[in-house]
């Protein structure tokens, strides 16, 4: 029992429980396919415990294996709209440092209006994750339709 | 090594490892869009370790950040069926206490017959999660096609 | 602080942090619907920490509840292709030992070219997971489009 108490008294950061869940803030200007995210209790149910936002992109603070997950829903969308605007594609990747740039997860919308996926991937302190939405449709800003998050899983 | 042994002897509940995976029991009467869930080893591969079921809805027992995930497949469904009955929508939310009612995750089927997603969200002891399926198609009760679960991630 | 250091010095395996993320190696011969996986840092961002590969199938080394996730994208696919080749179905299950054979997760592509899902399930040491893709379309081997992984969650 003393051990359990001691464990609870440790700062969570020392246990490596980095976690973040973000909501969409805005899209970039026309030539910038990146989605810009925001997080924090004042905004609703989004949060950052460990990772940070750098100009709307998520920056990792702790080395480790992470579960990365995302859902993006297109605004005012029907299957007809989605197929007409194909290809609309969402890619999550490390965009900086440039030496580590790589696409981690990629999905196309085809005739659907929502994509959702998740994967495990090693990330290093300083890695910045970008989410690129290519196509001519806007993502929904509803917090239950579009979100992006990471969870530290192990060193 | 002694530490590892001590850790294993702690009751798992004190480590905050609350987790549940549920299978569909039944749908509600016509005016009730909620899906009713069941869980337990006697039923197959579903289980509840911490959370509880309250009239087929999942009630949280420990404050924390949770990974919530769901997959729902429509019964006897083709892309034609699915598109004809658009909008068929699945929403996961906190339905009680009423003061905390909010939609956490929402997806439409469009021309697909399965939705699957996951997200991180803060939940509090006593929160009850409801899964609402709106539309005129039945969800599959096959345990590998329709399931709903939560996993405690951190305080 | 000494506790945190002690924790870090423990072998991770003793904490039960088994985790794997795999990339597609190849498909089987025509009568074999199984996907064959590969993993390891030399291959990119895939890895195995605990579980092992047995002839391209994932074998579990530690009892517990696991989060299983998968994404499969069909190669050279459009919604027209996908619907024309329906039913194309992906199933993840325990394929050995035979006494524990069961389908854990199943999705059809319908008019889409990607499926992605995840679920919690109990797995036992020695369980081998197979991923069966039925249909006449090939899965993409791009590592950001097709991947399969497991994460130990709790005993």
């Amino acid at each position: 029992q003393r051990f359990a108490q001691a464990q609870q008294q440790l700062p969570l950061e020392s246990l490596g429980w980095d976690v973040a869940e973000l909501q969409l803030n805005h899209t970039g200007p026309q030539q910038d396919p990146r989605l810009y995210w925001q997080g924090g209790p004042a905004l609703g149910r989004s949060f950052l415990h460990g990772p940070e936002l750098d100009k709307g992109q998520l920056r990792i603070h702790r080395d480790g294996i992470y579960m990365v997950h995302i859902q993006v829903t297109l605004a005012i969308c029907s299957s007809t709209t989605a197929s007409r605007h194909h290809p609309t594609t969402l890619a999550v990747g490390i965009c900086s440092p440039a030496s580590r740039s790589i696409s981690l997860l990629r999905l196309s919308f085809h005739q659907g209006c929502t994509i959702a996926s998740q994967r495990l991937t090693p990330l290093a302190r300083g890695d910045t994750l970008c989410t690129n939405l290519t196509g001519t449709l806007l993502p929904s800003r509803n917090t239950d339709e579009t979100f992006f998050g990471v969870q530290w899983v192990r060193p | 090594q002694r530490f590892a042994q001590a850790q294993q002897q702690l009751p798992l509940e004190s480590l905050g490892w609350d987790v549940a995976e549920l299978q569909l029991n039944h749908t509600g009467p016509q005016q009730d869009p909620r899906l009713y869930w069941q869980g337990g080893p006697a039923l197959g591969r579903s289980f509840l370790h911490g959370p509880e079921l309250d009239k087929g809805q999942l009630r949280i027992h420990r404050d924390g950040i949770y990974m919530v995930h769901i997959q729902v497949t429509l019964a006897i469904c083709s892309s034609t069926t699915a598109s004809r009955h658009h909008p068929t929508t699945l929403a996961v939310g906190i339905c009680s206490p009423a003061s905390r009612s909010i939609s956490l995750l929402r997806l439409s089927f469009h021309q697909g017959c399965t939705i699957a997603s996951q997200r991180l969200t803060p939940l509090a002891r006593g929160d009850t999660l409801c899964t609402n399926l709106t539309g005129t198609l039945l969800p599959s009760r096959n345990t590998d096609e329709t399931f709903f679960g939560v996993q405690w991630v951190r305080p | 602080q000494r506790f945190a250091q002690a924790q870090q010095q423990l072998p991770l395996e003793s904490l039960g942090w088994d985790v794997a993320e795999l990339q597609l190696n190849h498909t089987g011969p025509q009568q074999d619907p199984r996907l064959y996986w590969q993993g390891g840092p030399a291959l990119g961002r895939s890895f195995l920490h605990g579980p092992e590969l047995d002839k391209g199938q994932l074998r579990i080394h530690r009892d517990g509840i696991y989060m299983v996730h998968i994404q499969v994208t069909l190669a050279i696919c459009s919604s027209t292709t996908a619907s024309r080749h329906h039913p194309t179905t992906l199933a993840v299950g325990i394929c050995s030992p035979a006494s524990r054979s069961i389908s854990l997760l199943r999705l059809s592509f319908h008019q889409g070219c990607t499926i992605a899902s995840q679920r919690l399930t109990p797995l036992a040491r020695g369980d081998t997971l197979c991923t069966n893709l039925t249909g006449t379309l090939l899965p993409s081997r791009n590592t950001d489009e097709t991947f399969f992984g497991v994460q130990w969650v709790r005993p």
Epitope: - | Q30, I76, R84, L138, S140, N142 | -
Partner: antibody, heavy 120, light 111 residues
Framework: EVQLVQSGAEVKKPGSSVKVSCKAS????????MHWVRQAPGQGLEWMGA????????SYNQNFKGRVTITADKSTSTAYMELSSLRSEDTAVYYC?????????????WGQGTLVTVSS | DIVMTQSPDSLAVSLGERATINCRAS??????????MHWYQQKPGQPPKLLIY???NLESGVPDRFSGSGSGTDFTLTISSLQAEDVAVYYC?????????FGQGTKLEIK
């Protein structure tokens, strides 16, 4: 409560066509398949086909070899079943029917039936 | 097409006694955890009336002396205590695929 009201009895010559109507009360007409089922005198029930009024999509029983056409008018919440190349064995009561809620082919609501007699 | 075969073709049961009607499908009508089998009652000059849907669900307003059971290919409609108003023809019907088909009917009479 949904009500399905069908047109009146008809007497037709062999080789001719008949068109039966079914008017649905309520505002849910476009959202539910409308089915047609017939019953020959003293015989069982036979499904003929269905229409989804929302987009006009139809499904037919191949036993009727293209003789049946189902249409719908959303503005009047009315479905129609036309059967061509009539023969004596088409003498039957024709019912429209639909499910109360789910989009599967079991039938909670039925019209009162329309007797079609084919006789020379 | 799936062929539905009811047995018996006719049945005479005393008032207050149990009546059982069987229906067999030529292939399974179960899918996605449901059995897509339904039962109707038809009285002379009236359209059929839905009694049971999805094998065992009692339609609203139907007396609970009616019950349904079965899965796969074999199904049963049971009337636990026959009443005079239960005299009718009973039909089974599947909706597992198109076209939906009906059984030939079972005529239930009072002995």
């Amino acid at each position: 409560e949904v009500q399905l009201v069908q047109s009146g009895a008809e007497v037709k010559k062999p080789g001719s066509s008949v068109k039966v109507s079914c008017k649905a009360s309520g505002d849910t007409f476009p959202r539910y398949n409308m089915h047609w089922v017939r019953q020959a005198p003293g015989q069982g029930l036979e499904w003929m086909g269905a229409i989804f009024p929302g987009n006009g999509e139809t499904s037919y029983n191949q036993n009727f070899k293209g003789r049946v056409t189902i249409t719908a008018d959303k503005s009047t919440s009315t479905a129609y079943m036309e059967l061509s190349s009539l023969r004596s064995e088409d003498t039957a009561v024709y019912y429209c029917a639909r499910n109360s809620y789910y989009d599967y082919a079991w039938f909670t609501y039925w019209g009162q039936g329309t007797l079609v007699t084919v006789s020379s | 097409d799936i062929v539905m075969t009811q047995s018996p073709d006719s049945l005479a049961v005393s008032l207050g006694e149990r009546a059982t009607i069987n229906c067999r499908a030529s292939k399974s009508v179960s899918s996605s955890g449901y059995s897509f089998m339904h039962w109707y009652q038809q009285k002379p000059g009236q359209p059929p009336k839905l009694l049971i849907y999805l094998a065992s669900n009692l339609e609203s307003g139907v007396p609970d002396r009616f019950s349904g059971s079965g899965s796969g290919t074999d199904f049963t409609l049971t009337i636990s205590s026959l009443q005079a108003e239960d005299v009718a023809v009973y039909y089974c019907q599947h909706s597992r695929e198109f076209p939906p088909t009906f059984g030939q009917g079972t005529k239930l009479e009072i002995k």
